[in-house]
Amino acid sequence: EEELQVIQPDKSVSVAAGESAILHCTVTSLIPVGPIQWFRGAGPARELIYNQKEGHFPRVTTVSESTKRENMDFSISISNITPADAGTYYCVKFRKGSPDTEFKSGAGTELSVRAKPSAPVVSGPAARATPQHTVSFTCESHGFSPRDITLKWFKNGNELSDFQTNVDPVGESVSYSIHSTAKVVLTREDVHSQVICEVAHVTLQGDPLRGTANLSETIRVPPTLEVTQQPVRAENQVNVTCQVRKFYPQRLQLTWLENGNVSRTETASTVTENKDGTYNWMSWLLVNVSAHRDDVKLTCQVEHDGQPAVSKSHDLKVSAHPKEQGSNTAAENTGSNERGSSDYKDDDDKHHHHHH
């Protein structure tokens, strides 16, 4: 009689996480009598996966009925595979004894687990940045196997090239993580832009996973200011407007100063939105010129999104008015100043010229 051989026909088996893995094993003889055991790994630290003779193995079922006559098939099925199950599995024949002793091992079957990467998470900088600045975005995805993976970056559908990607760990592992950092140059038109991280993996059947970040969370477009004097509304009143254009985000506070003294402060509320996602707003000030003996320097000061204030001034000439109209020597007459603000719809294609 030929000596028993343990046949493991599959050198390797690949299984998707969550599925069952079938590990094939047959013996070539009924002799010697004794049980089959399955181990993961070899040597003294090997892990018992199934013992025909004794033990409780809730995830393991035998493919054939081992009690049946002349059974030589000791293949097993392991349910609900996870990346932690990856490794080399050995089918080992034992010889009956007290205790049973190892008789012969199969050559082993390497089980690899195909695990899907987690949904990519894209995160941007902690603080907003202005156009022309370069900002970094990170993309992370975890838990995938095998290690081979492809990551791409896009901005509004255009592939980016300035990025660095690492897959960890470098050595063998049950599962892997990917971390990538991309550099993006902001433009004034990026309020509606998206940065996309796309991950392709064998487990995704050609349907990559995407993570996105909206540049609206990252960009700050500072406003441009224009202060203009409108035609006289009443004999002694001048309407001065401050047009605040192309800003983002909306958080904005405007202060009027007359000769350096605060006249009024207001917060942008009813704004108009431009096609590019930026906002426009207009505020006006009615100045009673008869209340001023000298020329008035009107300043529109804007604090946008907590940044240092920017301002634009306009010199209001009062010398053209008769002196008696300016007989009120008070430097300011706040009662004469009507508060006002208005929506201002900017033409996106218009060029703005600002005059002091």
Partner: antibody
Framework: QVQLVQSGAEVKKPGASVKVSCKAS????????INWVRQAPGQGLEWIAM????????HYNQIFKDRATLTTDTSTSTAYMELRSLRSDDTAVYYC????????????WGRGTLVTVSS | DIVLTQSPDSLAVSLGERATINCRAS??????????IFWYQQKPGQPPKLLIY???NLDSGVPDRFSGSGSGTDFTLTISSLQAEDVAVYYC????????FGQGTKLEIK
Amino acid sequence: QVQLVQSGAEVKKPGASVKVSCKASGYTFTNYWINWVRQAPGQGLEWIAMIDPSDSETHYNQIFKDRATLTTDTSTSTAYMELRSLRSDDTAVYYCAMDYGSLYAMDYWGRGTLVTVSS
Amino acid sequence: DIVLTQSPDSLAVSLGERATINCRASKSVSSSGYNYIFWYQQKPGQPPKLLIYLASNLDSGVPDRFSGSGSGTDFTLTISSLQAEDVAVYYCQESRELPTFGQGTKLEIK
């Protein structure tokens, strides 16, 4: 270590029934056949029947088919052999034995249960 | 059913001598290249003990003075050098079909 522990001796009257138990330990009960064999005083071995605890498949010696019933309780790893309509010639030691190689052989044996049938 | 006939019914052998017990089946007990014959030893007051399986394979813990041979319908259990502890009744069993036992052979010391 495989162990088969059988229930104690029984004395029965003719026509009665007896149910002998065999509690298994040291192995996975559902993975191996259990055989029942009897031996009358001074006589040879006589195979009664066998049962696969995994699915309760049974094979009976035709001589005992109408009088013997094998069952198992997998929750307690116990096999049972019930013999009905006892006669005096059923007096014997009844053994359970485990088949370790699925060869329909008897690798490990219990110590036996003496059943005496006497009026 | 397959009937097994052992011979002799009893046997007396001197210590250190060879003892041979035969078992003949009423039809072949061979299947898939295996001979489904088993040999057991039973000492007084004890359950039987498996010695040989599939005609010629020594069970674990059995001294190598015991051996089995044969094929088809004729089988032999041999004790190469009889020891005092070998005194017992020996049974052959077949399982080509459902198990049956031979009638037993009583081995004594001469």
